[in-house]
């Protein structure tokens, strides 16, 4: 059973390592894949002394942990590299860090990337 599923056909693309990887630096990436597989968008970034450095954004393969996530939100407490994934076209355009610990109240730090 799948409720309110949103298709993902394209995602915001960014690659900080674009010269070495020989890709574009930024753009829109069409998401390809098998008919029976779901597609998602993702973003990865680092927080270097309070400054946000985007590592990559783009399409993400079918992953059950991305299902039903309409917003790209990292919820892990203090990760080394931040990661989020979501469903819906260009849903990785904005991403945020919203650590949820078991006991303490969560705090929200939304991020709008400026590649």
């Amino acid at each position: 059973a799948i409720l309110g599923r949103s298709e993902t056909q394209e995602c915001l693309f960014f690659n900080a390592n674009w010269e070495k990887d020989r890709t574009n630096q930024t753009g829109v990436e069409p998401c390809y894949g098998d008919k029976d597989k779901r597609r998602h968008c993702f973003a990865t970034w680092k927080n270097i002394s309070g400054s946000i450095e985007i590592v990559k954004q783009g399409c993400w393969l079918d992953d059950i942990n991305c299902y039903d996530r309409t917003d790209c939100v990292e919820k892990k407490d203090s990760p080394e590299v931040y990661f989020c994934c979501c469903e819906g076209n260009m849903c990785n355009e904005k991403f945020s860090y919203f650590p949820e610990m078991e006991v303490t109240q969560p705090t929200s730090n939304p991020v709008t990337p400026k590649p």
């Epitope: 409720l3 029976d36 597989k37 393969l61 942990n65 039903d68 919820k75 994934c85 949820e100």
Partner: antibody, heavy 118, light 111 residues
Framework: EVQLLESGGGLVQPGGSLRLSCAAS????????MSWVRQAPGKGLEWVSG????????FYTDSVKGRFTVSRDNSRNTLYLQMNSLRAEDTAVYYC???????????WGQGTLVTVSS | QTVVTQEPSFSVSPGGTVTLTCGFN?????????PSWYQQTPGQAPRTLIY???TRSSGVPDRFSGSILGNKAALTITGAQADDESDYYC??????????FGGGTKLTVLG
Amino acid sequence: EVQLLESGGGLVQPGGSLRLSCAASGFTFRNDAMSWVRQAPGKGLEWVSGISVTGGSTFYTDSVKGRFTVSRDNSRNTLYLQMNSLRAEDTAVYYCAKVYYTSFFDYWGQGTLVTVSS
Amino acid sequence: QTVVTQEPSFSVSPGGTVTLTCGFNSGSVSTSYYPSWYQQTPGQAPRTLIYNTNTRSSGVPDRFSGSILGNKAALTITGAQADDESDYYCVLYMGSGIWVFGGGTKLTVLG
């Protein structure tokens, strides 16, 4: 420390019902997909069911479709498996497992034994 | 119906190297199936060894490594030890919320 504690197993007659629970602690339950995996005596592991973070998407192996229902209560940090119309071939240890990105099982419970026999 | 195949049993000498494989009947295993590997000793819950083809789970010794070999996923154990004697299961994520386990490989460490 991540802990998954299954309960609700036991002896039931063919055609009967059971509800398994998996109490989760040590992580933010509502942030992760979850799954049930079973192992019949002396046999290999078999994936049974999976559920997305919100519970909005649920999935089953063919042999349990229409008989088993997976659900979750994110306010209680608990995963459930409602098993109806049980058959002898459902006899197994049932494990709940936390699912992480790239869809792998990163933590497992110790399992609860379900025996279907008359 | 997708069937995931593993060698039913395998033997290795202490200190030796063994490669267990995981294939399936519908084509080639690729990284898009997120192959993962689990170790299980009798009476115990499975333990996660490798995920996303080749990433070692926390606390897993570097004697264990994962890869794609030809059209199969592979788990290689180098410098096998007595306590590596276990059952090993591979899992493929087929997408759309569905996983398929292999039948498992029973690894015997000789001696």
